[in-house]
């Protein structure tokens, strides 16, 4: 037989299908010009020493073969002995290792069999009513096709699906969308209405994320507040990466999950902007305020579930950084200014009450005064911190108050509001004899002691009613008792106690009279 012709003899190997898993498959035959034809196939398994034979049976029942050698593609003309106008059945037999392996048969009319391309170029993926919709431009001069898809997940094999007939300049397919796993899709086409025409090759992989992006499993830590009043938010655990099917590993456009960080600054609610969204890779610096932090995952189908954390406020207090002067017109606070043209947010709330009851005030941008201080004043009528109770005050600063991540904490401290001098006066002062020349003075703790760092000391004042001499005894703010010694028997004394803050002298308690009895010896 001539090599260019189909040989109508028995092939040079025994006629027996080994039924092995390897072998030829995906046979495609089509016209490539007015008088030339091509068949191609794939061979699965070791290729060394394999000879391929293209078999053809005519409608008359006569059969022939082409010897392709080790090639998996073969061209022939309409003069090769194969009927091109009538239906023929073709298959490939591969002779390897003393056994024959056969491909599935294709039955077609070669003249009308056109080589169809798979979807080429950009395949658009969208979600439609819980399903996946793929859309692509029909390859040139190939309108009218039957389309199939196959899909797999990282843990499942290929499954075949049908897209149905297409006959437009754009073709589309509805496919199943997985909720929680990524999928790889491939598409193939063949001529519509041409009985037995060959399928095109499979398209390049189309990688599709799950409908729900994976919930971010991340952990944060917050560093200590630095000298600049800011603390760094750091990511302790990176988000888990999506597991991808085999053909999507490496570069898999379409399955990307983007993680965004949404910051919500809970403190200082009177500022202009409370939330900011950032890329997860760019970890911000935060003030000492309280924040809610959400990590939002999203893919091409939109956002998924988010994970939210609460970052509590830094409660480290500066006992002396804030100076408060109370005058007839109102109250003024002074603190070390941060820089030129800073906006300050002063926030206060009664101690022991829910954070939602915080009040705040935003200053206009201000420069330091000649002493390098920033100030905030309010009138008594405003009612700010007017009640006689303990307030927690935090001052934040920013040169760009509209940018959430540029706030810093200037200071946090406690302040006793209202008329602290009078409200702090100790009550229930009592005097007990201690020895022949001393007494013990006790009192109930001042209300100022409920306000950390506010009560500087108690002062106990004793007055000799006769000589009018006075003594003053400083007492630690944690103590509510002092022993007065060196007293003289028979002298009439009065004792009073006051509670002082760093900048306010307290009001004396009501005088208590006492004396030490003169001891008469027998």
């Amino acid at each position: 037989c001539r090599t260019s012709e189909c040989c109508f003899q028995d092939p040079p190997y025994p006629d027996a299908d080994s039924g092995s898993a390897s072998g030829p498959r995906d046979l495609r035959c089509y016209r490539i010009s007015s008088d030339r034809y091509e068949c191609s196939w794939q061979y699965e398994g070791p290729t060394a020493g394999v000879s391929h034979f293209l078999r053809c049976c005519l409608s008359s029942g006569r059969c022939c073969y082409f010897a392709a050698g080790s090639a998996t593609r073969l061209q022939f003309s309409d003069q090769a002995g194969v009927s091109v106008l009538y239906t023929v059945t073709l298959w490939v037999e591969s002779w390897a290792r003393n056994q024959t392996e056969k491909s599935p048969e294709v039955t077609l009319q070669l003249y009308n069999s056109v080589k169809y391309e798979p979807p080429l170029g950009d395949i658009k993926v969208s979600k439609l009513a819980g399903q996946l919709r793929m859309e692509w431009e029909t390859p040139d001069n190939q309108v009218g096709a039957e389309v199939q898809f196959r899909h797999r997940t990282p843990s499942s094999p290929w499954k075949l699906g049908d897209c149905g007939p297409q006959d437009d300049d754009t073709e589309s397919c509805l496919c199943p969308l997985e909720m929680n796993v990524a999928q790889e899709f491939q598409l193939r086409r063949r001529q519509l209405g041409s009985q037995g025409s060959s399928w095109s090759k499979w398209s390049s992989p189309v990688c599709v994320p799950p409908e729900n992006p994976p919930q971010p499993q991340v952990r944060f830590s917050v560093e200590q507040l630095g000298q600049d009043g800011r603390r760094r938010l750091t990511l302790k655990e990176q988000p888990t990466q999506l597991e991808l099917p085999e053909g999507c590993q490496g570069l898999a456009p379409g399955t990307e999950v983007t993680y965004r960080l949404q910051l919500h600054m809970l403190s200082c609610p009177c500022k202009a902007k409370a939330t900011r969204t950032l890329h997860l890779g760019k970890m911000p610096y935060l003030s000492g305020a309280a924040y809610n932090v959400a990590v939002i995952s999203s893919n091409q189908f939109g956002p998924g579930l988010n994970q939210t954390w609460h970052i509590p406020a830094d409660t480290h207090t500066e006992p002396v950084a804030l100076n408060i002067s109370v005058g007839t017109n109102g109250t003024t606070m002074y603190w070390p200014a941060r820089a030129q043209s800073m906006t300050y947010c002063i926030e206060w709330q009664p101690v022991g009450q829910d954070g939602g009851l915080a009040t705040c005030s935003l200053t206009a941008p201000q420069d330091p005064d000649p002493a390098g201080m920033a100030t905030y004043s309010w009138s008594r009528e405003s009612g700010a911190m007017g009640q006689e109770k303990c307030y927690y005050i935090t001052i934040f600063a920013s040169a760009h108050p509209e940018k959430l991540t540029l706030w810093s904490t200037v200071l946090s401290t406690y302040h006793f509001g209202g008329n602290a001098s009078a409200a702090g006066t100790p009550h229930h002062v009592s005097v007990k004899n201690h020895s022949l020349d001393s007494v013990s003075v006790d009192w109930a703790p001042s209300l100022l002691s409920t306000c950390p760092g506010v009560l500087k000391e108690y002062v106990v004042r004793c007055r000799d009613e006769d000589s009018k001499q006075v003594s003053e005894h400083p007492v630690q703010p944690t103590e509510t008792q002092v022993t007065l010694s060196g007293l003289r028997a028979g002298v009439a004394y009065t004792v009073q106690v006051r509670a002082d803050t760093a900048w306010l002298r307290g009001v004396w308690s009501q005088p208590q009279r006492f004396s030490i009895e003169v001891q008469v010896s027998d």
């Epitope: 000799d464 400083p474 060196g486």
Partner: nanobody, 123 residues
Framework: EVQLVESGGGSVQTGGSLTLSCTAS????????VGWFRQAPGKEREFVSA????????YYSNSAEGRFTIAVDNAKNTVYLQMNSLNPEDTAVYYC????????????????WGQGTQVTVSS
Amino acid sequence: EVQLVESGGGSVQTGGSLTLSCTASGRTGSTDGVGWFRQAPGKEREFVSAIKWIGGSKYYSNSAEGRFTIAVDNAKNTVYLQMNSLNPEDTAVYYCAAGAIMFPSRPRDFDFWGQGTQVTVSS
């Protein structure tokens, strides 16, 4: 034995201020603290102010309270008396003394005395 040296006296106009210093040496730990007394010509020595070495308790006469402030620097064993709003009645020799601090204070409670420093207030 405790030695006491006063300084800071001088002349001042009515309404003026002076700060007196008293530096102690020797066995200061045997005393409660330091007191200031004054003696005007032809008058008895009178108590002005006192302070304890430990605890910082302060003592003032009726006339000194509100105008004078006593303070101690333990590291230097020095006691200071800051006198404001001085008037001619404050003219006297001011003595520093160390000893037991009783209340009310009297000169006889104090065992160790300095030489004194003159304060003159003119109108």
